[in-house]
């Protein structure tokens, strides 16, 4: 009971409010399928409270189960474009440390120009998340069309 | 430490459990692209705990970062219908106060009949969220096909 | 105030951290449209903390408002396949107890090969959630393409 009481008296931050919502900064150079993200109040409605950006990739600072969500809209896209350039695929995964590398979330565009999904997944301090967009189409940089975020849910 | 202890002794409600899940009430009159929402246990599985409805639009009562989510399915829709009536677009945004007006989330239907997405965004007490459906197709009123909600995540 | 203080001194688990993320185990026998799920660290990144599996269906252990989310990708699928086999529909609902049976979330694939959505809904202890996939196409078992989860949000 003592422990529980002490635990409750920690600042709420210590209960784990880690959260981030990012906007697209740019795509990678040729042969690099990764999307590069940015965040911060100066940029609009994106933010990082806990997680950090490491060369445009999201690095986790607190162990726990996270809700990961993403929406990517292709620029200058119609269903004709999307099907002509098929396959265009988005994958979100842990890309470092290499020992923990895994794909968490994968979607193809088929005849659509937007994908959006979310999932719960355990993440550990130091995990870096990468979002790989494969294909020849480019993502929209509009902040209401393309975004990526995580929310700490429980230990 | 005193402050943290006092803070922990507030009812849990004060930690910010604001949440709402709404079902479609009706579309707007001509030239008004907004969807009008309703919520409450008498209507089924929709509810408002904290946020309120103001003429069918959702008004926020507590500052914080929110997870906003939406699904809209078009009535009497097939991929042929959707492409024939293209563009049909859904946008979720802050529509008042005017000084904070911004689009938060935008999706087009292309050859699909349902859009679904979610994002994290800072909202302030008094922000009213509007959901604009542009195009000639109409949203389904089935409660498992069309819904809109917010969940307070952190201060 | 006494009650609030005592309440705060309960272990955090008692605040309701119930959460589950499941991966597809198998589809049902003919005439059974249900998807059968599995979860646990031995299987990869799926887990159950609170809810339980009952013959592959998810059973809730704590009353509250939950965020329910799902992604299902069809195996060996292209937009041509999807439209040729239309309608293929996914519905998530409470399937038992029978008195609470209701559809919570419904999406059709149309010309796409993946559906993904989420919603907030009240669930009660003992509610069992079923995910029905109707049509002739089969879901992918890849853990980054097909998954289903719930997260307790508030009482």
């Amino acid at each position: 009971q003592r422990f529980a009481q002490a635990q409750q008296q920690l600042p709420l931050e210590s209960l784990g409010w880690d959260v981030a919502e990012l906007q697209l900064n740019h795509t990678g150079p040729q042969q690099d399928p990764r999307l590069y993200w940015q965040g911060g109040p100066a940029l609009g409605r994106s933010f990082l409270h806990g997680p950090e950006l490491d060369k445009g990739q999201l690095r986790i600072h607190r162990d726990g189960i996270y809700m990961v969500h993403i929406q990517v809209t292709l620029a200058i896209c119609s269903s004709t474009t999307a099907s002509r350039h098929h396959p265009t695929t988005l994958a979100v995964g842990i890309c470092s440390p290499a020992s923990r590398s895994i794909s968490l979330l994968r979607l193809s565009f088929h005849q659509g120009c937007t994908i959006a999904s979310q999932r719960l997944t355990p993440l550990a301090r130091g995990d870096t998340l990468c979002t790989n967009l494969t294909g020849t189409l480019l993502p929209s940089r509009n902040t209401d069309e393309t975004f990526f975020g995580v929310q700490w849910v429980r230990p | 430490q005193r402050f943290a202890q006092a803070q922990q002794q507030l009812p849990l409600e004060s930690l910010g459990w604001d949440v709402a899940e709404l079902q479609l009430n009706h579309t707007g009159p001509q030239q008004d692209p907004r969807l009008y929402w309703q919520g409450g246990p008498a209507l089924g599985r929709s509810f408002l705990h904290g946020p309120e409805l103001d003429k069918g639009q959702l008004r926020i009562h507590r500052d914080g970062i929110y997870m906003v989510h939406i699904q809209v399915t078009l009535a009497i829709c097939s991929s042929t219908t959707a492409s024939r009536h293209h563009p049909t677009t859904l946008a979720v945004g802050i529509c008042s106060p005017a000084s904070r007006s911004i689009s938060l989330l935008r999706l087009s239907f292309h050859q699909g009949c349902t859009i679904a997405s979610q994002r994290l965004t800072p909202l302030a007490r008094g922000d009213t969220l509007c959901t604009n459906l542009t195009g000639t197709l109409l949203p389904s009123r089935n409660t498992d096909e069309t819904f809109f909600g917010v969940q307070w995540v952190r201060p | 105030q006494r009650f609030a203080q005592a309440q705060q001194q309960l272990p955090l688990e008692s605040l309701g951290w119930d959460v589950a993320e499941l991966q597809l185990n198998h589809t049902g026998p003919q005439q059974d449209p249900r998807l059968y799920w599995q979860g646990g660290p031995a299987l990869g990144r799926s887990f159950l903390h609170g809810p339980e599996l009952d013959k592959g269906q998810l059973r809730i252990h704590r009353d509250g408002i939950y965020m329910v989310h799902i992604q299902v990708t069809l195996a060996i699928c292209s937009s041509t396949t999807a439209s040729r086999h239309h309608p293929t529909t996914l519905a998530v609902g409470i399937c038992s107890p029978a008195s609470r049976s209701i559809s919570l979330l419904r999406l059709s694939f149309h010309q796409g090969c993946t559906i993904a959505s989420q919603r907030l809904t009240p669930l009660a202890r003992g509610d069992t959630l079923c995910t029905n996939l109707t049509g002739t196409l089969l879901p992918s078992r890849n853990t980054d393409e097909t998954f289903f989860g719930v997260q307790w949000v508030r009482p």
């Epitope: - | 479609l24 009430n25 009706h26 579309t27 009159p29 001509q30 009535a75 000639t136 109409l138 009123r141 | -």
Partner: nanobody, 113 residues
Framework: QVQLQESGGGLVQAGGSLRLSCAAS????????MAWHRQAPGKQRELVAI???????NVDDSVEGRFTISRDNAKNMVYLQMNSLKPEDTAVYYC???????WGQGTQVTVSS
């Protein structure tokens, strides 16, 4: 109490046509999205056609090219024009204020082969 009243149903041979009408008191039709549903024996009620306030209508794929929905806001009326009728179109047809639980009594349409 607002009433919706359908008319125009009947018995028709396959390939024939019918025009269903829906009338209401007040301005209920003029001010709302309207729909036609149908229910065949032993089947669930299904949405067949829908029309927005501005007059843009949409019909289900199963009746595309054969049925059209229209409205006359001045007369507070909504119509369903049904051409090239098939036996599988046999059902009770209901007029509905789509976003409200407001229904007519229905009109029987029987298509004989």
């Amino acid at each position: 109490q607002v009433q919706l009243q359908e008319s125009g149903g009947g018995l028709v041979q396959a390939g024939g046509s019918l025009r269903l009408s829906c009338a209401a008191s007040g301005s209920i039709i003029r001010d709302n999205v309207m729909a036609w549903h149908r229910q065949a024996p032993g089947k669930q009620r299904e949405l067949v056609a829908i029309i927005n306030i501005g007059g843009s209508g949409n019909v289900d794929d199963s009746v595309e090219g054969r049925f059209t929905i229209s409205r006359d806001n001045a007369k507070n009326m909504v119509y369903l024009q049904m051409n090239s009728l098939k036996p599988e179109d046999t059902a009770v047809y209901y007029c509905n204020v789509y976003y409200r639980d407001l229904w007519g009594q229905g009109t029987q349409v029987t298509v004989s082969s």
